[in-house]
Amino acid sequence: KSPVFGPQEVSSVEGNSVSIKCYYPPTSVNRHTRKYWCRKGASGRCITLVSSEGYVSSNYAGRANLTNFPENGTFVVNIAQLSRDDSGHYKCGLGINSRGLSFDVSLEVSQGPELPNGTEVYTVDVGRTVTIKCPFKTENAPKTKALYKKIGQTSVLVIDSRNYVNPNYKDRIRLRIPGTGQLIFTVVIDRLRLSDHGLYLCQAGDGSNRDEKNADLQVLEPEPELVYEDLRGSVTFHCALGLEVANVAKFLCRVNSRETCDVVINTLGKRDSAFEGRILLNPQDKDGSFSVVITGLRKEDEGRYLCGAHSDGQLQEGWPIQAWQLFVNEESTIPRSPTVVKGVAGGSVAVLCPYNPKESQSLKYWCLWEGAQNGRCPLLVESQGLVQEQYEGRLSLLQEPGNGTFTVILNQLTTQDAGFYWCLTNGDTRWRTTVEIKIIEGEPNLKVPGNVTAVLGETLNIPCHFPCKFSSYEKYWCKWSNTGCQTLPSQDEGPSEAFVNCDENSRLVSLTLNPVTRADEGWYWCGVKQGHFYGETAAVYVAVEEKKVAGSRYVSPAKADAAPDEKVLDSGVREIENKAIQDPRLFAEEKVVADTGDQAGGSRASVDSSSSEEQGGSSK
């Protein structure tokens, strides 16, 4: 007996859609083998109509698809715009059509229920609005207009032109009679409920001359859209509920085991703490549509999600909804990267951000998640070099190590830097990831002077002290600009034995500027790295002033000033729409800094990693 299972009988009506789910044991082989849906012919052969390898027969073009959910051992065949010709015997299966891993499915497409002649059929989703059109003759223009609902053999009055409204329809129904000359009245029912389903009768006038029109109202609960996203990745729920609710509070909720719906986020400021730092509700368009982005997907995020509109910001019967069934694929293409990065006050962090390696040319961004109201994520830095003003000199986005990962370095950390940050690109939105920066107790490992004043035309040496644990790392100095941090030409660091027996006298890398020019003013970073992977950095600002006293200047760490206080974000910073991102409404980019000028000239700057402090001063 075949291990594949599905519905033996599927019945539907013309014009409708079916979603046929076939279940299989999720062994490694089964998960990755071909899935198919075929129709059994008179000869006994089964002709493929759609398969997981992308094949769609001409008969199914534009109206059918097959989606595999390997972790759940399920694949789904969706067929839309059914006709009676689709009635027949089918198989859903794995592998080759003629082999035994399949399941027989009978599909019956009927004309629909027998309805009175001339019945108009209205098919509407729950919570939406329907407008029932009711024609009448001229002689019935001045007479009473009414809408009845047929329940069994009786007709129940729903609304009439004498201002009667059935209590079941209170505050959500209206009867409109047009001006003279138009021989049609309409009944508009808002916020449709499942109980509104049924046969209705429009009537104008009474007696034998009355006009009648039948309307069949089918109210459907939306079939959840199946969404299959990678662990650690991102999902976007696009929610379009219609103009009728454009000005009503919106929400996204997740259905729980009690079949109620827990609010995940709404426009009234509510947010589930499980989604802290990794959710945004996009500002809605004029048509009332909005979207919700969730990053850093976890297995426990799986489930049924509903978006909707209601003044309370939560699910209520009879209000429009959209539904999704989210599955999180544990066989993720998104690499593991730390979700929490820790740094100390005054220190630094280097964050690795994954991106789709097929999109190496995409623009890379880093933004700070802000939880207020619906959440927003203003850009702090992007690969084209724009850096937000208050991050000048302490933030850089590097394309390294490349091949699906970029690096963001933030230094001069303060407690205000703690929070959630998003890595993203203007390409594949599913690769948005979240990282939390935590500020912990401790001292920075790299020590540089707080700030330095250099004299024009003279020589400047800036020491950077590192602990023994970094002795095997590559040390570098670079000059920061808003387009990155240009590494300064490094001189031979001398024999490697200098660091083998690491002691107090062999932990110094010095930057020498000789002679100092105006262009040397700016931020310099001392850092350590291993190959293309960056470690800690420390920043020092070099101010350049006119010559006062002749001679060279050496800055000793003992005379170094304290690092300047972090500039705090001005809450009034203007938001600028960022055109580079696919969904520009999701993120706002703050004021950006102009380029800070030329890099220090190559031959004038040198980096010296010496075996003793005394030797650190000279430029070789």
């Epitope: 599927v10 409708n16 499942l194 939306p222 049924r304």
Partner: nanobody, 126 residues
Framework: QVQLVESGGGLVQAGGSLRLSCAAS????????MGWFRQAPGKEREFVTA??????????YYADSVKGRFTISGDNARNTVDLQMNSLKPEDTAVYYC?????????????????WGQGTLVTVSS
């Protein structure tokens, strides 16, 4: 909260027929799965049949052991589901449970149903 009440159980001769009914009260849904499971004395509960309504279409599932003999039907507007059992065999003897599940997802043979009835006893004598 949804309550499920089964009826129609009883004693029947082998080869005979029986019709079980299940009524759900407490909530209206246009999209959910209702199923029948059974548990014979000393055995584990097993799937018998299920019906799923979704988007105006109906999907019916049967266990191999009852295919061709049992027929499930229902009216989702009235939240009822019936099980017509023909050609009954002594091995069909069991307590039959009605179950409802609100999610349209998941294998209907599984136990992940949200609501269960108290059960009705069907005894098939030889």
């Amino acid at each position: 909260q949804v309550q499920l009440v089964e009826s129609g159980g009883g004693l029947v001769q082998a080869g005979g027929s029986l019709r079980l009914s299940c009524a759900a009260s407490g909530r209206a849904f246009s999209q959910y799965t209702m199923g029948w499971f059974r548990q014979a004395p000393g055995k584990e509960r097993e799937f018998v049949t299920a019906i799923r309504w979704s988007g105006g279409s109906i999907y019916k599932y049967y266990a191999d052991s009852v295919k061709g003999r049992f027929t499930i039907s229902g009216d989702n507007a009235r939240n009822t589901v019936d099980l017509q059992m023909n050609s009954l065999k002594p091995e069909d003897t069991a307590v039959y449970y009605c179950a409802a599940r609100m999610s349209p997802w998941g294998d209907p043979r599984g136990n992940e149903y949200d609501y269960w009835g108290q059960g009705t006893l069907v005894t098939v004598s030889s």
